[in-house]
């Protein structure tokens, strides 16, 4: 199994209960809150890994600007419904009956309603703006170290294919990184966006998800790179559905 | 060879809480996770909960989220579970399981509770 | 949660005959599922994993099949001593599920 054997922990998830049991006696690791077996080879999902938190004992320009109908997760932690292959579920519903559609990096996408509320397929996020402002330094970062010393922690730490990192702009101390995956391009076994830039988000703000592994220490040319800000938008195959007293 | 000792019977007043031992033996004890499974007479399973004895780890069935409570004792290799305020709804057979964290290899004779005034 | 339903709830047979048991997940649960037996006042006991996987010291007889959402145990020569309840248990995800189960009896 892809579980470290020796002890048996799960090297990309911290947010699991891993035991010699599994078939075979090889070694298990179920997401907490859900129960569901993950692939400790691999970044685990984002819908996984909100449950198992919820279940915790919480001018000229170069930078993108985002669509206009670019989603900003303003509704922060839930306690979501997974699939049975850990993703998102189009419909989410709180305790109260309150209802809402999700894309697949289960950010709402619709005003909220009743039980009534009918989500047809699950929208996939094919495009995700992280849009970084890093602490004052000495000076500038170096524009092509920065974007090799990201791309290369994207490809190293998040295992996602370097070809889903569509760009790195700079222009200090603004830092957007763009990643972009349509349903076409992904292939088995690719790791998500949704997923790497949940777990990047999760590593700048100091709570790493990798099991025993430091916090995550950027460095470009040996220079910290010590972000003090993060927003991430999320850019929609199909553009979200929302009522015009939302968008004044 | 693995062994989980259940005591045959508990006699029980209703509102007096009671706790079932299921005690393991023949394997490391804190490698595998204690399953807890209700049976009332002539009725199916029921899933209960599960414990992980190397760091007690519990998840429960919603339904028995407030009346069963789980816990373990590395020392004596036993796991326990509460199960508070108990009415004759709660009168059944429990089965303490283990050896696995999927199909459950390993099950105890289970506990007949009787909950009776 | 996910739900299993077993069918049928009875299922009467003649010694020598074969005999399938079905569990139905309300989800794809992949080979997550196991079966049990279990005779009058006895505990359970498990007879296949993931589906289609052999337990060591059971009969041969025994054997499971199916993935996804149907699933199927079936004993190909049944003997008098197979007379018990049978269960279907998903460890998809928790809480983990036990089918409502099915008795067997020998005609």
């Known amino acids: 199994h892809t579980a470290a054997q020796d002890n048996c922990t799960c090297p990309t998830n911290k947010m699991t209960v891993c035991s010699p049991d599994g078939p075979g006696g090889r070694c298990q690791c179920r997401a907490l809150g859900s129960g569901m077996a993950v692939d400790c080879s691999t970044l685990t999902s984002k819908c996984l890994l909100l449950k198992a938190r919820m279940s915790a004992p919480k001018n000229a320009r170069t930078l993108v600007r985002p669509s206009e109908h670019a989603l900003v997760d303003n509704d922060g932690l839930y306690d979501p419904d997974c699939d049975p292959e850990g993703r998102f579920k189009a419909r989410q519903c709180n305790q109260t009956s309150v209802c809402w559609c999700v894309n697949s990096v289960g950010v709402r996408r619709t005003d909220k309603g009743d039980l009534s509320l009918r989500c047809d397929e699950l929208v996939r996020t094919h495009h995700i703006l992280i849009d970084l402002r890093h602490r004052p330094t000495a000076g500038a970062f170096n524009h092509s170290d920065l974007d090799a010393e990201l791309r290369r922690l994207f490809r190293e730490r998040y295992r996602l294919h370097p070809k889903f990192v569509a760009a790195v702009h700079y222009e200090q101390p603004t830092i957007q990184i763009e990643l972009r995956q349509n349903t076409s391009q992904k292939a088995a076994g690719d790791v998500d966006i949704g997923d790497a830039a949940y777990y990047f988000e999760r590593d700048i703000k100091g709570e790493s998800l990798f099991q025993g592994r430091g916090g995550l220490d950027l460095r470009v040319r040996g220079e910290p790179l010590q972000v003090e800000r993060t927003l991430i938008y999320y850019l929609d195959e199909i553009p979200p559905k929302f009522s015009m007293k939302r968008l004044t | 060879q693995v062994q989980l000792q259940q005591p045959g019977a508990e006699l029980v007043r209703p509102g007096a809480s009671v706790n079932l031992s299921c005690k393991a033996s023949g394997y490391t004890f804190t490698s595998y996770w204690i399953n807890w499974v209700k049976q009332r007479p002539g009725q199916g399973l029921e899933w209960i909960g599960n414990?992980?004895?190397?760091?007690?780890?519990?998840n429960y069935n919603q339904k028995f989220k407030d009346t069963a409570t789980l816990t373990v004792d590395k020392s004596s290799s036993t796991a326990y579970m509460q199960l508070s305020s108990p009415t004759s709804e709660d009168s059944a057979v429990y089965f303490c399981s283990s050896y696995r964290s999927d199909g459950f290899a390993y099950w105890g004779q289970g506990t007949l509770v009787t909950v009776s005034a | 949660d996910i739900l299993l339903t077993q069918s049928p709830a009875i299922l009467s047979v003649s010694p020598g005959e074969k005999v399938s048991f079905s569990c139905r997940a309300s989800?794809?649960?992949?080979?997550?599922i196991h079966w049990y037996q279990q005779r009058t006042n006895g505990s359970p006991r498990l007879l296949i994993e993931?589906?289609?996987e052999s337990i060591s010291g059971i009969p041969s007889r025994f054997s499971g099949s199916g993935s996804g959402t149907d699933f199927t145990l079936t004993i190909n020569s049944v003997e008098s001593e197979d007379i018990a309840d049978y269960y279907c248990?998903?460890?998809?995800?928790?809480?983990?599920?036990f089918g409502g189960g099915t008795k067997l009896e020998i005609k």
């Open positions: 414990i992980y004895p190397s760091n007690s780890y519990t």
């Open positions: 248990q998903q460890s998809n995800s928790w809480p983990f599920t």
């Open positions: 993931f589906a289609s």
């Open positions: 989800q794809n649960i992949g080979t997550s």
